[in-house]
Amino acid sequence: AMHVAQPAVVLASSRGIASFVCEYASPGKATEVRVTVLRQADSQVTEVCAATYMMGNELTFLDDSICTGTSSGNQVNLTIQGLRAMDTGLYICKVELMYPPPYYLGIGNGTQIYVIDPEPCPDSDF
């Protein structure tokens, strides 16, 4: 299996944005790569977002995706937006080298993203 590295822990910003790098050790010269972000919480795994891209080009997520990203060589910089405290969990980076054959699959150990909802601003008495 292809090795995929990602940070162990990331803290989301107060605006609910978390970014992390997913790096893969490519055994071949892939031209088309698919990156999927999976969320694992309470032993349930769900797909957060996925994008296919050409090496050297931008990642294209669906318009309604909460993810954006850029690629550079064998690194993918992923950003997940709109996160709330309930979204805290393990976010796993899955990389597939699709074309040309052969196919390679790599799954990272996951990045624990902590999301803390901002405290509401107290009402001001003037």
Epitope: T31, E32, T52, Y53, M54, M98, Y99, P100, P101, P102, Y103
Partner: antibody, heavy 118, light 107 residues
């Protein structure tokens, strides 16, 4: 039910051109790579070309590189093969096939016959 | 290119017989080996992919095995509807290549 229907074959003189089409239905076309495979009369199967689901990746057999162009229109659920500078050895039944992992052709159309002859 | 060599090129067997077709790749193709069935005058159909996984709707009398460069398609009990030409195909590297085919007939 997965259905692939080819059209566009016919008789053409050497050096001529043809454009094959393949209309797909019964599955989400934009989720799958597609391939063209041909079979000369009484012969075996020969892979011709492949295009990935979003058309990011396109590949051809060596003998077709520069002469054939594969393309797709995901909005129309259609696959195409533009064939130029046709030769007698291109005479065959051309099949369009759906291609998912592991680089296998899991569903095939009924084929369209291309005859190159003077 | 990876060459795929099938043997035998043709065979004749009785209904109920166990039939074995072999396919040899010119280099290691890992598990990217697929088998197709083409009945006379018909379109090829995927039988087996990833060496041994049956495609949907394929009877369990068909099975595949092998690894690396040597692979086998087995029909455990030949039926009249199995009369066809069988092709192996490698998906390990481009160009994807097929074996020459094995024509199976009933005695």
């Amino acid at each position: 039910e997965v259905q692939l229907v080819e059209s566009g074959g016919g008789l053409v003189k050497p050096g001529g051109s043809l454009r094959l089409s393949c209309a797909a239905s019964g599955f989400t076309f934009s989720d799958y790579g597609m391939a063209w495979v041909r079979q000369a009369p009484g012969k075996g199967l020969e892979w011709v070309s492949f295009i990935s689901n979003l058309a990011y990746s396109v590949y051809y057999a060596d003998t077709e590189t520069g002469r054939f162009t594969i393309s797709r229109d995901n909005a129309k659920n259609s696959l195409y093969l533009q064939m130029n500078s046709l030769r007698a050895e291109d005479t065959a039944v051309y099949y369009c096939a759906r291609s998912g992992l592991p680089y296998a052709m899991d569903y095939w159309g009924q084929g369209t016959t291309v005859t190159v002859s003077s | 290119d990876i060459q795929m060599t099938q043997s035998p090129s043709s065979l004749s067997a009785s209904v109920g017989d166990r039939v074995t077709i072999t396919c040899r790749a010119s280099q290691d193709i890992s598990n990217y080996l697929n088998w197709y069935q083409q009945k006379p005058g018909k379109v090829p159909k995927l039988l087996i992919y990833y060496i041994s996984r049956l495609h949907s709707g394929v009877p369990s009398r068909f099975s595949g095995s092998g690894s690396g460069t040597d692979f086998t398609l087995t029909i455990s009990s030949l039926q009249p509807e199995d009369v066809a030409t069988y092709f192996c195909q490698q998906g390990r590297m481009l160009p994807w290549t097929f074996g020459g085919g094995t024509k199976v007939e009933i005695k």
